[in-house]
């Protein structure tokens, strides 16, 4: 791998203007390795992942290496540096800890094999933010209709542990989805900035599944959903006094 030649080649094409990484999974039509996802859970670290189908039957492919460069000053650093950590984020990945991560500069990454570039992407960390799932989901009963057929509940949760919400480093918006257990389609509620929301008019004799996911406000993508919260509403006959719920 010739660092200076590769640097000259990519710098001449203004790497920061290359296509940004699509945080979602990409289909890999060619046999060459490709970046599948770069993700930052909390704006302080990030990792990038790639496919490795090539090692199943393609000839003469050397080890896959990831190199990165950041625009730290005046021009792109004149060297491509190799991935600082191939282990922490799992197989076919590179992990950048907080020392390597700043939201205030663009990054370019490339995959190489046998000294040749097989894929390259540029991005800013904020574009690849996908928070960890919200945690500690629970619910409380708000009230029950006079007929005893419908009930309203309040669902609460907590932000992911690694999201620095208190200092405002991350501002998360949440999306709650719910459905009856035997249904396939989830009902989506409008995104909110709070960590609790009322869900109205649930059928008392049904069991519901509730899940929540979050994204950084104004940038990034939704992260994975929380674990499912199961909501079973007791039958009206189990309530001692209807007035208690008004």
């Amino acid at each position: 791998f010739s660092g200076s030649e590769a640097t000259a080649a990519i710098l001449s094409r203004a790497p920061w203007s290359l296509q940004s990484v699509n945080p979602g999974l990409k289909t890999n039509s060619s046999k060459e390795p490709k970046f599948t996802k770069c993700r930052s859970p909390e704006r302080e670290t990030f990792s990038c992942h790639w496919t490795d189908e090539v090692h199943h039957g393609t000839k003469n492919l050397g080890p896959i290496q990831l190199f990165y460069t950041r625009r730290n000053t005046q021009e792109w650093t004149q060297e491509w540096k190799e991935c600082p950590d191939y282990v922490s984020a799992g197989e076919n990945s590179c992990y950048f800890n907080s020392s390597f991560t700043s939201i205030w500069i663009p990054y370019c990454i490339k995959l190489t094999s046998n000294g040749g570039t097989v894929d390259e992407k540029c991005f800013s960390v904020d574009e690849i933010v996908q928070p960890d799932p919200p945690i500690a989901l629970n619910w409380t009963l708000l009230n029950v209709s006079l007929t005893g057929i419908h009930a309203d509940i309040q669902v609460r949760w907590e932000a992911p542990r690694n999201a620095d919400i208190q200092k405002g480093w991350m501002v998360l918006e949440y999306e709650l989805q719910y459905k009856e257990v035997n249904e396939t389609k989830w009902k989506m509620m409008d995104p909110i900035l709070t960590t609790s929301v009322p869900v109205y008019s649930l059928k008392v004799d049904k069991e519901y599944e509730v899940r929540v996911r979050s994204k950084q406000r104004n940038s990034g993508n939704y992260g994975e959903f929380s674990e499912v919260l199961y909501v079973t509403l007791p039958q009206m006959s189990q309530f001692t006094c209807e007035e208690d719920f008004y």
Epitope: N72, S102, S219
Partner: antibody, heavy 115, light 108 residues
Amino acid sequence: EVQLVESGGGLVKPGGSLRLSCAASGFTFSDAWMDWVRQAPGKGLEWVAEIRSKANNHATYYAESVKGRFTISRDDSKNTLYLQMNSLKTEDTAVYYCTLYRDYWGQGTLVTVSS
Amino acid sequence: EIVLTQSPGTLSLSPGERATLSCTATSSVSSSYLHWYQQKPGQAPRLLIYSTSNLASGIPDRFSGSGSGTDFTLTISRLEPEDFAVYYCHQYHRSTPTFGGGTKVEIK
């Protein structure tokens, strides 16, 4: 050679508005992340706002002290950066510098907010 | 936000002397994201050192930078008449970008 030339500064009353411009040349403006940094008379430097390139969806960032009052924007076809300043306060009085990645700086334009 | 405190506020030295300027951060800053600027009266700041220890283009090698974590230092080995100016440290690691309050290096 990178050149950044600010204009639009002047005297304005508290509560008033002003729009600063920065004409850029010597680099590919459309690819660049641009910032405004200000310096109150006799004081230190304070970062104000940043706007990123089209490839980065022209994402914008602001200092808490100006959020909701200032708007950073750009016109890539004119190689020009802007800072729209509304609801100006006396504490906004400063020299405003246009910067390329906070590496290259213009000479600045003075904004004075006074009644 | 990360607050950068520079000391001393003013440094009175003679040409030829060594100047040592300090910048302390309220929380850890990666060395990659700590820069130093020089500003002369009536002029815009000029990038002096980037990523803690790298000289920006056209900067003489009497300037050097060091440090890690929360403590960073700018050293001018032998002051030249043109070095008398205000120096600012700057970080853009975790919080919004911030600058130190500046150290004025004046002629004794």
